[in-house]
């Protein structure tokens, strides 16, 4: 069918003279995609965030928006451009019919379009009881400066800024972007409207019950009186922060996002951009007793995502739900019956529970750490938060069985002193998303931009996997795990470390011809072995068992099954030294572990032999864990014997640098 669209390509309503760029077609071979919230009741059809390609200028964004309006008008559709984004993400927010999505997706510069959706405050319940005065803890930490060099932005409800706890500490910005309250009979009541934000501001920086008593805060209103907001409103809030940062650069910034909505590509992308601009973002994991990866901004890798525990270090239950969990959670923090400022009166206190409260604790801790060390990067701060956390105190039985291994058993704690951690080699474990069950499925785990991938391992609950390998992707190493035929899927597990001035590479040995097994070592001068990986193409590795002990004098060597290719991660960094530590059990065991000693950090974790009854290996804090199939299925043959291989490293250079500072 012939359509005379060409006649109207110059159609730019109200801006008739501007005709440049209107005839452009989308770049060849690129297809924009449409995304919407997986949780139907949270969807907001009729409002869309049109995200443009990364290098798009503001003028092009405006022109694209006008072009959409013009082409829509020609089809008889009304549209309204609600906001043009720039500074964080290029794009625009448009109110339009869903009928126009196909048209909008074909516009030049469009990367993807996301339907707007709701986000919610993550505290339950509100206004339980008034407790005046607040309870004091005898062991309450009294920091010297309490985060005074740091500014904490709070994106939440309105707040009662004249509350005794936060008066003079919180500056209420003029930013407000909230949806209408639901229900025709809803009455706005100031104390209810301010409840959530006031409490959280108190938890972060309150005079009596605050974590970082010296921190100054700025509040942005993105949640209405019912604690409900939108992804688009949150995006515009984050953009406001970025613009404020550019106009008036201050010291370190912490952004607290005590809210959650369904998984949102655009919200995660905005968080990533802000994080890469040097801002520390802390968010609530969510109160849905669910995988935090299904929610945003909790699922954004650059954000510090916080789950909630109670005074007994147990995961918080909230009615029929509770704290979220899983690989997208970085750590947990107190989130049950937390005493804080109540908006009922200027001296009232109240207890609230939820992952919002937990996130506020971590935002306070972050503010204090940054105040003590303002030059800390996001990666350094995250690693320190993990390092100083209480380990292995959470009862994992509360989590669904398949999530236990993925969920960090860490409860946030203030560092014993604000200085003196610089000598430490910090590492953390990053799990990939599940690969899915298809034969060729793979899973990829990535480290943060300023972290080094020092080792890569894999894990499959069924044991059907084809190992893992480190490979370059976009100029950085990533960890890729491979599923096997009949497998239910795999996880890739990256060991991500802070190693300044590191130069790391991967050395590979193809499957060996000889029966002795495959081996590879770090042959470059000054390079030390930080991790071993193995990958095989065969569906089922045989029971061939290579010699477990390495030849003397060759610590920089990875050994593995003769049918597998072996990959050694070899790094050169000032003062870096590493050693291999093995723990073998001759009888079949479901779990074998080996830990690094005090002063050494686990960088690599792998299993010997790599036979098919080994489910995989992964690092938990400073311990290497190797899991095998249920003993009852393997019998007690020598095939059941497994060795856990840990590579433990330390940096004399970091230790010296730290001593020089003191």
């Amino acid at each position: 069918q012939e359509d005379e669209d060409g006649d109207y390509e110059e159609l730019v309503l109200a801006l008739r003279s501007e005709e440049d760029g209107l005839a452009e077609a989308p770049e060849h071979g690129t297809t924009a995609t449409f995304h919407r919230c997986a949780k139907d009741p949270w969807r907001l059809p009729g409002t869309y965030v049109v995200v443009l390609k990364e290098e798009t200028h503001l003028s092009q964004s405006e022109r694209t928006a006008r072009r959409l309006q013009a082409q829509a008008a020609r089809r008889g559709y009304l549209t309204k451009i609600l906001h043009v984004f720039h500074g964080l993400l290029p794009g625009f927010l448009v109110k339009m019919s869903g009928d126009l999505l196909e048209l909008a997706l074909k516009l030049p510069h469009v990367d993807y379009i996301e339907e707007d959706s709701s986000v919610f405050a993550q505290s339950i319940p509100w206004n339980l009881e008034r407790i005046t005065p607040p309870r004091y803890r005898a062991d309450e930490y009294q920091p010297p400066d309490g985060g005074s060099l740091v500014e904490v932005y709070l994106l939440d409800t309105s707040i009662q800024s004249d509350h005794r706890e936060i008066e003079g500490r919180v500056m209420v910005t003029d930013f407000e972007n909230v949806p209408e309250e639901d229900g025709t009979r809803f009455h706005r009541q100031a104390s209810k409207c301010d409840s959530h934000g006031t409490h959280l501001a108190g938890v972060v920086s309150g005079r009596d019950a605050g974590v970082a008593k010296g921190a100054s805060m700025r509040s942005l209103r993105v949640l209405n009186c019912q604690g409900k907001g939108t992804v688009s409103g949150t995006l515009i809030g984050l953009e406001f922060i970025r613009k404020s940062q550019l106009v008036q650069p201050v010291g370190p910034l912490v952004v607290l996002l005590p809210l959650a909505g369904g998984y949102s590509r655009v919200l995660n992308a905005a968080c990533q951009r802000l994080a890469r601009a040097g801002v520390v973002l802390v968010t609530a994991a969510g109160n849905f007793r669910d995988d935090a990866c299904l929610y945003s901004p909790a699922s954004a890798p650059e954000v510090i995502t916080v789950g909630a525990t109670n005074a007994q270090d147990q995961p918080v239950t909230l009615g029929t739900l509770g704290t979220n969990f899983g690989r997208c959670v970085d750590l947990f923090a107190p989130g049950e019956d937390i005493i804080g400022a109540s908006s009922d009166c200027s001296t009232c206190f109240v207890s609230q529970s939820g992952t919002s409260q937990a996130a506020a604790h971590v935002a306070g801790i972050a503010a204090m750490m940054l105040s003590a060390e303002p030059e800390l990067t996001l990666a350094e701060l995250r690693q320190r938060l993990i390092h100083f956390s209480a380990k292995d105190v959470i009862n994992e039985a509360w989590f669904p069985e398949d999530q236990r291994v993925l969920t960090p058993n860490l409860v946030a704690a203030l560092p014993p002193s604000t200085h003196g951690a610089g000598w430490q080699l910090f590492c953390r474990t990053v799990w990939s998303a599940h690969s899915g069950p298809t034969r060729m499925a793979t899973a990829v785990a990535r480290c943060a931009p300023d972290e080094e991938l020092l080792s890569c391992s894999s894990f499959s609950r069924s044991g059907k996997r084809r190992g893992e390998r480190m490979e370059a992707q976009g100029g950085k190493l990533v960890c890729r795990a491979h599923n096997a035929f009949g497998g239910e899927g795999v996880y890739a597990i990256a060991r991500c470390c802070l190693l300044p001035q590191a130069n790391c590479s991967v050395h590979t040995a193809p499957p060996a011809e000889a029966s002795m097994g495959t081996r590879v070592h770090c042959h470059q001068q000054g390079h030390v072995l930080t991790g071993c990986s193995s990958h095989w193409e065969v569906e089922d590795l045989g029971t061939h068992k290579p010699p477990v002990l390495r030849p003397r004098g060759q610590p920089n060597q990875c050994v593995g099954h003769r049918e597998a290719s072996i990959h050694a991660s070899c790094c050169h960094a000032p003062g870096l030294e590493c050693k291999v530590k093995e723990h073998g059990i001759p009888a079949p065991q479901e779990q074998v572990t080996v830990a690094c000693e005090e002063g050494w950090t686990l960088t690599g974790c792998s299993a010997l032999p790599g036979t098919s009854h080994v489910l995989g290996a992964y690092a938990v804090d400073n311990t290497c864990v190797v899991r095998s199939r249920d003993v009852s299925t393997t019998g007690s043959t020598s095939e059941g014997a497994v060795t856990a291989v840990a590579i433990c490293c330390r940096s004399r250079h970091l230790a010296q640098a730290s001593q020089e500072l003191q």
Epitope: L13, R75, G76
Partner: antibody
Framework: QVQLVESGGGLVQPGGSLRLSCAAS????????MHWVRQAPGKGLEWVSN????????YYADSVKGRFTISRDNSKNTLYLQMNSLRAEDTAVYYC???????WGQGTLVTVSS | DIVLTQSPATLSLSPGERATLSCRAS???????LAWYQQKPGQAPRLLIY???SRATGVPARFSGSGSGTDFTLTISSLEPEDFAVYYC?????????FGQGTKVEIK
Amino acid sequence: QVQLVESGGGLVQPGGSLRLSCAASGFTFSDYYMHWVRQAPGKGLEWVSNISGSGSTTYYADSVKGRFTISRDNSKNTLYLQMNSLRAEDTAVYYCARGMFDFWGQGTLVTVSS
Amino acid sequence: DIVLTQSPATLSLSPGERATLSCRASQSVNSNYLAWYQQKPGQAPRLLIYGASSRATGVPARFSGSGSGTDFTLTISSLEPEDFAVYYCQQWGDVPITFGQGTKVEIK
């Protein structure tokens, strides 16, 4: 070229029903809002109803609400107006128009008289 | 509802003269959705101006539109014999869509 052809008009008694059709060609019919506009003899233009490209959204003038129903069949490139409980004041030439009213049909006359 | 009032009801002019037609809205109208039509006896309306000021395809340059908010104008710089007709303004940015009552441009 774009063409809109109305049909189905005629003489009908008050209280009766009629179904108008508008056959579209020369453009991607499902992309466009479509409208019905009427003009009583010697009078001005009056908008009657419209429907979105997918058919999911419809609007009506107060004067016809509850009596007229707009619909479309995108597979047949046809717009419809089902008119029930017709009154004398519904007598007019009925036009279908596309999108931003850039193309109109030639109109079909509906006469409501006893 | 947005009421559009056109003035004058009738405009008597000679060919070559300038015609100025006014359309006033009872409340502010988004000018993106303000249009002008020409209708001759026995014919369907024809779109002249969309977006308050943009000429539709094939419309001679002597036709121009202007205005914003509540006041809009259609100007015919020099009347040609074929321009004598009825002219309607219309807003379609709000439901119900409304038309002005029309201005008849007749030969003096």
